[in-house]
């Protein structure tokens, strides 16, 4: 059965998935999809990485951790009730039927209180990034600017936003971790 994670409407949700690269920079392709893991790849893909980089990415879904070190945990920005459901993290370890599949269940709760109107931070503006999709389908490039310097205030704010949907250490214990090599 799927491990369950919770977040409130308007929060960022955090779905953990980790692997240990055999050597630094020796990355394994990973996909995230909405829906349980099918036979190959992920269904309704929201994000992919290849051996080098994130190569497919849809709005509101991003990797906040250091994916080059195997932290491929998914952050879903500003969740709504429609984001509830099962998500698949698939670590595509080369070889014969070597893929590791993790189904994670996200439960979105209504917000406890309606906050006073405040200026909502534009995450795309705060964290623009360059994304080039290559291979694996029709060529498509989206340039969203380069990654800026992130200051401690931003990191602290992010940490607060993520706290409710589980701490990283708890998540590592949930089983969505695989060691390679």
């Amino acid at each position: 059965s799927e491990v369950e994670y919770r977040a409130e409407v308007g929060q960022n949700a955090y779905l953990p998935c980790f692997y240990t690269p055999a050597a630094p920079g020796n990355l394994v392709p990973v996909c995230w999809g909405k829906g349980a893991c099918p036979v190959f790849e992920c269904g309704n893909v929201v994000l992919r990485t290849d051996e080098r980089d994130v190569n497919y990415w849809t709005s509101r879904y991003w990797l906040n951790g250091d994916f080059r070190k195997g932290d491929v945990s998914l952050t879903i920005e500003n969740v709504t009730l429609a984001d509830s459901g099962i998500y698949c993290c698939r670590i595509q370890i080369p070889g014969i039927m070597n893929d590791e599949k993790f189904n994670l269940k996200l439960v979105i709760k209504p917000a406890k209180v309606t906050p006073a109107p405040t200026r909502q931070r534009d995450f795309t503006a705060a964290f623009p990034r360059m994304l080039t999709t290559r291979g694996h389908g029709p060529a498509e490039t989206q340039t969203l600017g380069s990654l800026p310097d992130i200051n401690l205030t931003q990191i602290s704010t992010l940490a607060n936003e993520l706290r409710d949907s589980r701490l990283a250490n708890d998540l590592r214990d949930s089983g969505a971790t695989i060691r390679i090599g």
Epitope: G33, G35, A36, P38, V39, F40, E41, C42, G43, N44, V45, V46, Y56, T58, Q92, I93, P94, G95, I96, M97, N98, D99, T133, G135, H136, G137, P138, E140
Partner: antibody
């Protein structure tokens, strides 16, 4: 136009080996998962093996993985199925098929199929 | 392995009729189900994927439905070119498995 053309099959002896090939054209071969499916005459379809875009990940029907090897040559746009220790129950029409794909989908169903090649294993 | 049970095994119908073919999975496969049509001596053709999405170029008289373990393919107003064999395939569990097929014949 997407085309998948399998090599000639034929009659082979039990215990022997055979390598099938499937030449692809009309699409960017290296962007797609590829699959072999077989069909015994007048019977249903049976998945045999699949391979990912760059050939680093392969998937097999459990009962065949010790005897069959799927591979691909993206430079030549060719999919292969190397079969060894052939048995009479391997007699079938073998189809190569392309995994349906677009960004955001998974290649778990097959949108183009070859015409099929018939392999008969008999003494 | 996930078993796919198709029914009926064969079906006779006339042009203009509506027919329904069903497929049952031995366990929950969510919406990971595909339908193919295969005519005599030809390769299979993709009809419906993800239980209900019509493949490109497939006439709208075909429709798929269901999720979990129960699925169906409905063909409204049968046309002469619709006769042949129909197969369901699940793509949730390894190995990929197909139903045994339904033979749709002209009455």
């Amino acid at each position: 136009e997407v085309k998948l053309v399998e090599s000639e099959g034929g009659l082979v002896q039990p215990g022997s080996s055979m390598k099938l090939s499937c030449t692809a054209s009309g699409f960017t071969f290296s962007d797609y998962y590829m699959t072999w499916v077989r069909q015994v005459p007048e019977k249903g379809l049976e998945w045999v093996a699949s391979i990912n875009y760059d050939g680093r990940n392969t998937y097999y029907l459990d009962s065949l993985k010790s005897r069959f090897i799927i591979s691909r040559d993206n430079a030549k746009n060719i999919l292969y199925l190397q079969m060894s220790s052939l048995k009479s129950e391997d007699t079938a029409t073998y189809y190569c098929a392309r995994g349906y794909y677009y960004y955001g989908s998974s290649p778990n169903y097959f949108d183009y199929w070859g015409q099929g090649t018939t392999l008969t294993v008999s003494s | 392995d996930i078993q796919m049970t198709q029914s009926p095994a064969s079906l006779s119908a006339s042009v203009g009729e509506t027919v329904t073919i069903t497929c049952r999975a031995s366990e929950n496969i969510y919406s990971y189900l595909t339908w193919y049509q295969q005519k005599q001596g030809k390769s299979p053709q993709l009809l419906v994927y993800n239980a209900k999405t019509l493949a490109e170029g497939v006439p709208s008289r075909f429709s798929g439905s269901g999720s979990g373990t129960q699925f169906s393919l409905r063909i409204n107003s049968l046309q002469p070119e619709d006769f042949g064999n129909y197969y369901c395939q699940q793509h949730y569990g390894t190995p990929l498995t197909f139903g045994a097929g339904t033979k749709l014949e002209l009455k």
